[in-house]
């Protein structure tokens, strides 16, 4: 999906009002310096591409983020404020239902959510030059 036509300001507002708090809640008890940010993005569409990937695509050691409140809010934000987003996703994932597993917060998930926090912060500051 091409995120170029999203309403970035509405997504930013959703992040600032709710998603950011849910990410902080998830990371509670973790030092902010514990993980190095290794994933970056260069502009808002690119940031949303990376956020989508990190939030919804299962990775080795962390398969459970879709059940988290920040993930559901991200999913709905993209569906509402990115024209055509939900249409592309309905067909792509209709046959991928999996049996629910017990929710476990692993260190790998904490690292992944730390990366997400960095991507969201970058999304909110699109005019900053890449470090």
């Amino acid at each position: 999906y091409d995120f170029t036509n999203c309403d970035f300001e509405k997504i930013k507002a959703a992040y600032l009002s709710t998603i950011s708090k849910d990410l902080i809640t998830y990371m509670s008890g973790t030092k902010s310096t514990e993980f190095n940010n290794t994933v970056s993005c260069s502009n808002r569409p690119h940031c949303l591409t990376e956020i989508q990937s990190l939030t919804f695509n299962p990775t080795a050691g962390c398969a459970s983020l879709a059940k988290e409140m920040f993930a559901m809010k991200t999913k709905a934000a993209l569906a509402i404020w990115c024209p055509g987003y939900s249409e592309t996703q309905i067909n792509a994932t209709q046959a991928m239902k999996k049996r629910r597993k017990r929710k476990v917060t692993t260190n790998k998930c904490l690292e992944q959510v730390s990366q997400l926090q960095g991507l969201w912060r970058r999304f909110n500051r699109p005019l900053l030059k890449q470090q």
Partner: nanobody, 120 residues
Framework: EVQLVESGGGLVQPGGSLRLSCAAS????????MGWFRQAPGKEREMVSA???????YYADSVKGRFTISADNSKNTAYLQMNSLKPEDTAVYYC??????????????WGQGTLVTVSS
């Protein structure tokens, strides 16, 4: 799997009101989002509103200030109060519920849809 049944659609005059209901049955989980999509003839399906288990809500610009989403957790039901309806609100309205059990970006459960027609 959660089953969703919508009701409340119908024919209404411009400026009128309707309240859609979406009753969920089946498994229930702590974190969830319930929302409403709509699809007008010949147009893409669009999400117009969402409500989360923590009470926060989202609205599309096209309905903000006119539509109100709410949920009654004791009844496992979500509502969409639609006021100041316009002809362009005419569409099939679909309820969705999600608790993160799908691997990917779509929503777990979809209702069959209820038709809303705004016409004089």
């Amino acid at each position: 799997e959660v089953q969703l049944v919508e009701s409340g659609g119908g024919l209404v005059q411009p400026g009128g009101s309707l309240r859609l209901s979406c009753a969920a049955s089946g498994n229930s989980f702590n974190n969830y989002v319930m929302g409403w999509f709509r699809q007008a003839p010949g147009k893409e399906r669009e999400m117009v509103s969402a409500i989360f288990s923590d009470g926060s809500t989202y609205y599309a610009d096209s309905v903000k200030g006119r539509f109100t989403i709410s949920a009654d957790n004791s009844k496992n039901t979500a509502y969409l109060q639609m006021n100041s309806l316009k002809p362009e609100d005419t569409a099939v309205y679909y309820c969705v519920r999600d608790s993160g059990s799908v691997s990917g970006q779509t929503f777990d459960s979809w209702g069959q849809g209820t038709l809303v027609t705004v016409s004089s």
